[in-house]
Amino acid sequence: LVVTPPGPELVLNVSSTFVLTCSGSAPVVWERMSQEPPQEMAKAQDGTFSSVLTLTNLTGLDTGEYFCTHNDSRGLETDERKRLYIFVPDPTVGFLPNDAEELFIFLTEITEITIPCRVTDPQLVVTLHEKKGDVALPVPYDHQRGFSGIFEDRSYICKTTIGDREVDSDAYYVYRLQVSSINVSVNAVQTVVRQGENITLMCIVIGNEVVNFEWTYPRKESGRLVEPVTDFLLDMPYHIRSILHIPSAELEDSGTYTCNVTESVNDHQDEKAINITVVESGYVRLLGEVGTLQFAELHRSRTLQVVFEAYPPPTVLWFKDNRTLGDSSAGEIALSTRNVSETRYVSELTLVRVKVAEAGHYTMRAFHEDAEVQLSFQLQINVPVRVLELSESHPDSGEQTVRCRGRGMPQPNIIWSACRDLKRCPRELPPTLLGNSSEEESQLETNVTYWEEEQEFEVVSTLRLQHVDRPLSVRCTLRNAVGQDTQEVIVVPHSLPFK
């Protein structure tokens, strides 16, 4: 389609005459406000179709949209249409008139809408106001469409100034139908019960006045109906509750319980389901693995945690070396068992600033009248290594010895290293590791002892140096899982008179 002039926006003089032409490969027609105004249609020798719309004695009321579309009963593939918007600035026309339908805007949800107040002159400044207020609202204006935005359930007017007079539009009314969607919540006093105990479920709806409840449950499927009770919890907003109560539950009552709520006015519905388990007798089950050997670091706090499932709620006891533990008044031990869901529990033993004496055999026992479970582990207290002694001696044999003694838990490893260039070591030159069996110039002898009372290992290592011809820095490093410690000593040759 080809439109002359092409637009898409034209500003024409009042009282003037103007010609619009549209041409295309099939019959074309001009449309204005869903009507076909009088126009001249023609077909050229080259097969081109055209339509000429002559606008005479233009007034502000001619302001608006004009469309050129194909007018072909053969139904061309294309839905092509060309839009042109014409302004005819006319001081005698304030706002363009609206149909009644355009003055009342009806909504069921929060969505962007347009308040279609339009003027004849694109240069005019137009503002939007609540009908009862003078303050202009910060809403974007399009001269071809009006004010677009999200509007509250109020009445609005548009204002503009033409010359020196202020002009008001008709009032526009926004009606929002507050359709309260149904929101159902279902909960049970307990989702796990033993046979013979009661099942009680509640289905609650908020904000609706007239609703219908329908329950489905395992007993219903076998034809054994239970009559629910419905009550109002609060007046505003409406809280309506349906209670389904099944006394003396049986194993067959296990399954899905569904509450379906409908309200007929707007045909809304919602449903929620909950699973109920009826067990023959109570249970206690450990969840997850706890290693049989646990570690704690000396003087640090350590929490040991056991997770388990149980119904009904169990009694939990902790033991150390078969003696019952309790919260100590000095705050050195803290015991807690908390319910993290209806049937899941976490029991924690916290040792504050761990001492060596707290190493030992620990047991947690959870039990009730139907079942019990216990879990045991050995607690090892890890002690960072300390080098307690590093000494050098000159036995008569002529060799020189360096003795290193240290303690820690778990057993420390010992690393000997030496540095020959005292000026550059250890910053520039890495120390040489000693004690490798292939080297003849040094020999290593290491003894390890476990001290039961202190519950730690002692390492004593002796390094024998065959011939020391210049001063040597010898370093002893002890390392274990929780730390390391180093000491060094300068070893000088026999020939030097000083130490």
Partner: nanobody, 116 residues
């Protein structure tokens, strides 16, 4: 507080007519139109028409012109909307609504079902 209470659901055969009432209480009868709107399930609200409180001024949606009439009983404060020559596509929930300037007020809706 304005309250609008509508008549109950109706089931009609094609070609019949239906008259829906809307009783208004707490309503200032002089300053606001009573609107009638309908909603086919799953579709947008469609304007049906309006009448003024005294019942001497009505405007109908062009689509329904000639098939709809709106009247008012000022003594009881009841508005009526009557739709004639019912068709299956007239099946909808019909609402009356009015505007207080700072908010709108709605009836609870009346379901009209047209079915042979």
């Amino acid at each position: 507080q304005v309250q609008l209470v509508q008549s109950g659901a109706e089931v009609k055969k094609p070609g019949a007519s239906v008259k829906v009432s809307c009783r208004a209480s707490g309503y200032t009868f002089t300053n606001s139109f009573m609107q009638w709107v309908r909603q086919v399930p799953g579709q947008r609200l469609e304007w049906v028409g309006l009448s003024n409180p005294s019942g001497d001024y009505t405007v109908y949606a062009p689509k329904l012109q000639g098939r709809v009439t709106m009247t008012t009983d000022t003594a009881t404060g009841t508005f009526y909307m009557e739709l004639f020559s019912l068709r299956s596509d007239d099946t909808a929930v019909y609402y009356c609504a009015t505007h207080g300037g700072d908010r709108s007020y709605w009836g609870q809706g009346t379901l009209v079902t047209v079915s042979s």
